[in-house]
């Protein structure tokens, strides 16, 4: 089941999924003054069985002023900008994503791609949420949204990642301090305390980290 | 179960200090930003400070900016206010709140008064 | 003066329902942020009653509910219950700011 909406829009923040659930399209869409082939296909799925999966299907571009087919290679690094999904200002990797079966890894890119990426996604879907470059968060840990099926319908659940700007501290914003606890949750500490996913850090990609202030009910 | 338990409120003459705690239990204090809220009496609400889950950046409303300092001790799961130059009209029952804030203590009043 | 603007009373009998709206601005509710609201019932300590727009934490009766739309926010509650008496406040984090805003609290009396 495809999700009805876009993951939600968070001020001064990105969001990337890790892994793509089986079902999920990706457009095949070029940059400007390129266009998907001809007979070429219209989006990459990602489908797979019990052990593995992949993308099906490949986009490929060629150039808007010629008739002929470009051949196909994986552009340099540098010559991706800005996809949608690769936002993230430093890296954020709460798994490997290969570990996680049912689902594909983020698609090499190909020759003459668009600079943003359109994800279909599907139910069940995670999304990780990171404040962009300038901004830190009020408060540690991934927040994540999930799309789930409620009363028929497809919601993303909201994070509520708080990105604040300038400092008003004498520290300087790229120090950090250190943690006065470890990560690890204590034993002795059964509830959560918040909310959404903004503050619910234990999840099913990420099972070490810690929990949510409320409880997981609040999904 | 969450607790949030606020200590150091009481009577101070104008000009002075106070200094509040606000001890944390029931989930993992050093994970979360922390505010401080005030309501003075028969009012609304109003917030005060904020400080990030490591203590590295904090923001004040304009009202305590210069004369109210918060700060957290992750090892000891305790937040703080540092109240000077304390003037009438901080008079009011402070609240430590956690997270949105979505969980608060029960607050401890201050009164300012000469 | 409170950032959020809230009615300053509200009225209803059992069994109606009554709607609380929350307006605000570019810099917090318009901004994109979420809207919360607490209820706060005589001498005690506000408590969460909807987070994120039109979330609920277990707990809390599907009485009550939340919506949100531009620079405003509105709190519904159906079936009015005597214990719904309260003072409400709305909330949203406010990126001039970079704190939470309050609204100045409704005062929800049931008839």
């Known amino acids: 089941e495809l999700c009805d909406d876009d993951p939600p829009e968070i001020p001064h923040a990105t969001f990337k999924a890790m892994a793509y659930k089986e079902g999920t399209m990706l457009n095949c869409e070029c940059k400007r003054g390129f266009r998907r082939i001809k007979s070429g296909s219209l989006y990459m799925l990602c489908t797979g069985n019990s052990s593995h999966s992949s993308w099906d299907n490949q986009c490929q571009c060629t150039s808007s002023a010629t008739r002929n087919t470009t051949k196909q290679v994986t552009p340099q690094p540098e010559e991706q900008k800005e996809r949608k999904t690769t936002e993230m200002q430093s890296p954020m990797q709460p798994v490997d994503q290969a570990s996680l079966p049912g689902h594909c890894r983020e698609p090499p890119p190909w020759e003459n791609e668009a600079t943003e990426r359109i994800y279909h996604f599907v139910v069940g879907q995670m999304v990780y949420y990171q404040c962009v470059q300038g901004y830190r968060a009020l408060h540690r840990g991934p927040a994540e949204s999930v799309c789930k099926m409620t009363h028929g319908k497809t919601r993303w659940t909201q994070p509520q990642l708080i990105c604040t700007g300038e400092m008003e501290t004498s520290q300087f914003p790229g120090e950090e301090k250190p943690q006065a606890s470890p990560e690890g949750r204590p034993e002795s500490e059964t509830s959560c305390l918040v909310t959404t996913t903004d503050f619910q850090i234990q999840t099913e990609m990420a099972a070490t980290m810690e929990t949510s202030i409320f409880t997981t009910e609040y999904q | 179960e969450v607790q949030l338990l606020e200590s150091g409120g009481g009577l101070v003459q104008p000009g002075g200090s106070l200094r509040l705690s606000c001890a944390a239990s029931?989930?993992?204090?050093?994970?979360?930003?922390m505010h401080w809220v005030r309501q003075a009496p028969g009012k609304g609400l109003e917030w005060v400070s904020v400080?990030?889950?490591?203590?590295?950046?904090?923001y004040y409303a304009d009202s305590v900016k210069g004369r109210f300092t918060i700060s957290r001790d992750n090892s000891k799961n305790t937040l703080y206010l540092q109240m000077n130059s304390l003037r009438a009209e901080d008079t009011a029952v402070y609240y430590c709140?956690?997270?949105?804030?979505?969980?608060w203590g029960q607050g401890t009043l201050v009164t300012v008064s000469s | 003066q409170s950032v959020l603007t809230q009615p300053p009373s509200a009225s209803g009998t059992p069994g109606q329902r009554v709607t609380i709206s929350c307006t605000g601005s570019?810099?917090?509710?318009?901004?994109?942020?979420?809207v919360h609201w607490y209820q706060q019932l005589p001498g005690t300590a506000p408590k969460l009653l909807i987070y994120?727009?039109?979330e609920r934490p277990s707990g809390v009766p599907d009485r009550f509910s939340g919506s949100k739309s531009g620079t405003s926010a509105s709190l519904a509650i159906s079936g009015l219950r005597s214990e719904d008496e309260a003072d409400y406040y709305c909330?949203?984090?406010?990126?001039?700011?970079?704190?939470?805003?309050f609204g100045g609290g409704t005062k929800l009396t049931v008839l």
């Open positions: 994120s727009n039109n």
């Open positions: 709140a956690a997270g949105v804030p979505d969980y």
């Open positions: 909330a949203a984090w406010d990126s001039s700011l970079n704190g939470p805003v």
């Open positions: 570019s810099s917090n509710i318009g901004a994109g942020y979420d």
């Open positions: 400080i990030s889950y490591d203590g590295s950046y904090k």
């Open positions: 029931g989930f993992t204090f050093s994970s979360y930003g």
